[in-house]
Interface confidence: medium
């Protein structure tokens, strides 16, 4: 396994894709299949990642680099290096422990992943609702009522909403 390194360490000559074979007087042996060494001077090759099940192979393992996975259709990557695959939902939904659920009234999700987020509250910026929100889309805020004096804008003011940022689904 490990021997004291010297200035003439024979293992330092073993390139990536090989390992320093202690069983064979420290000659450089090629990495076995399904394994790799990404740096020189290694005393073993590491096990390649296997893209199985919901994972699919984006890049095959080579003797010098690990495999890279992504997710099968209907799933998306999570975590560093796509360590997990999470189920896609439709726009207007979020993934819960019980599966995909529609966004609650007053929230939206315009992607196939992630959580439902609250509609923008236009009144906090002194603006009014120009386009009502839906499960899939945020509200669109328009100019404040004061900006809509005659001649100030050609935009037709929207019908006043009962509560800024809310609309019937």
């Amino acid at each position: 396994f490990e021997r004291t390194r010297s200035l003439q360490d024979p293992c330092s000559n073993c390139p990536a894709g090989t390992f320093c074979d202690n069983n064979r007087n420290q000659i450089c042996s090629p990495c076995p299949p399904n394994s790799f060494s990404s740096a020189g001077g290694q005393r073993t090759c590491d096990i390649c990642r296997q893209c199985k099940g919901v994972f699919r192979t984006r890049k095959e393992c080579s003797s010098t680099s690990n495999a890279e996975c992504d997710c099968t259709p209907g799933f998306h990557c999570l975590g560093a290096g796509c360590s997990m695959c999470e189920q896609d939902c439709k726009q207007g939904q979020e993934l819960t422990k019980k599966g995909c659920k529609d966004c609650c009234f007053g929230t939206f999700n315009d992607q196939k992943r992630g959580i439902c987020r609250p509609w923008t509250n236009c009144s906090l910026d002194g603006k009014s609702v120009l386009v009502n929100g839906t499960k899939e889309r945020d509200v669109v805020c328009g100019p404040s009522p004061a900006d809509l004096s005659p001649g100030a804008s050609s935009v037709t003011p929207p019908a006043p909403a009962r509560e800024p940022g809310h609309s019937p689904q």
Partner: antibody, heavy 115, light 113 residues
């Protein structure tokens, strides 16, 4: 000198849990993939689980998938096997061989699952 | 998964005589780089397994030269040129190509007649 010392075995009832440990020394642990291999009394060798050097990638035999979890702590040169929902057929000596081709083996630790 | 089959399962031997164990795999273990990824292990009574031969024919460090491995593809043989008393134990072959999972043969018990 390479040393692998397994511990944590014992007698448990079906459905209970146990955590095995493997203390490694004498080699650069963090560079080596590790594994657990077991041997039921009077039976042959059976691969249980493997883990990559960084701990990012873990592999399991179908017989233990969903019940066992392999992990490693490279700072402490240690390997672990968390075994949940143990069954009578998990009774075996558990070894932690080092390297892709199981170059070195420890003495093993006995796990007995019996009611 | 690859299935490994060893024969015989029991082998009575005479010290000083040769001995041979066969191992067959359900799929070829010959890789494109020319190596056969088959390993042999010996488990002496009351001890843990030890690597004897790796990649078909390469002796592991410290293994006496009376042990040799041969074969290619799906058929492999472990030979002991002159059996010694300390060679008794159970010999296992293991495929190291399509891993994980690793799969072992059932084992061959070598004992003195």
């Amino acid at each position: 000198e390479v040393q692998l010392v397994e511990s944590g075995g014992g007698l448990v009832k079906p459905g209970e849990s146990l955590r095995l440990s493997c203390a490694a020394s004498g080699f650069t642990f963090k560079s080596y993939p590790m594994a657990w291999v077991r041997q039921a009394p009077g039976k042959g060798l059976e691969w249980v689980s493997s883990i990559s050097s960084s701990g990012d990638h873990r592999y399991y035999a179908d017989s233990v998938k969903g019940r066992f979890t392999i992990s490693r702590d490279n700072a402490r040169n240690s390997l672990s096997l968390q075994m949940n929902n143990l069954r009578a057929e998990d009774t075996a000596v558990y070894y932690c061989p080092a390297g892709r081709d199981f170059d070195h083996w420890g003495r093993g630790t006995l796990v007995t699952v019996s009611s | 998964d690859i299935v490994m089959t060893q024969t015989p399962l029991s082998l009575p031997v005479t010290p000083g005589e040769p001995a041979s164990i066969s191992c067959r795999s359900s799929q070829s273990l010959l890789y494109s780089n020319g190596y056969n990824y088959l390993d042999w292990y010996l488990q002496k009574p009351g001890q843990s397994p030890q690597l004897l031969i790796y990649w078909g024919s390469n002796r592991a460090s410290g293994v006496p030269d009376r042990f040799s491995g041969s074969g290619s593809g799906t058929d492999f043989t472990l030979k002991i040129s002159r059996v010694e008393a300390e060679d008794v134990g159970i010999y296992y072959c293991m495929q190291a190509l399509h891993v994980p999972p690793y799969t072992f043969g059932q084992g061959t018990k070598v004992e003195i007649k």
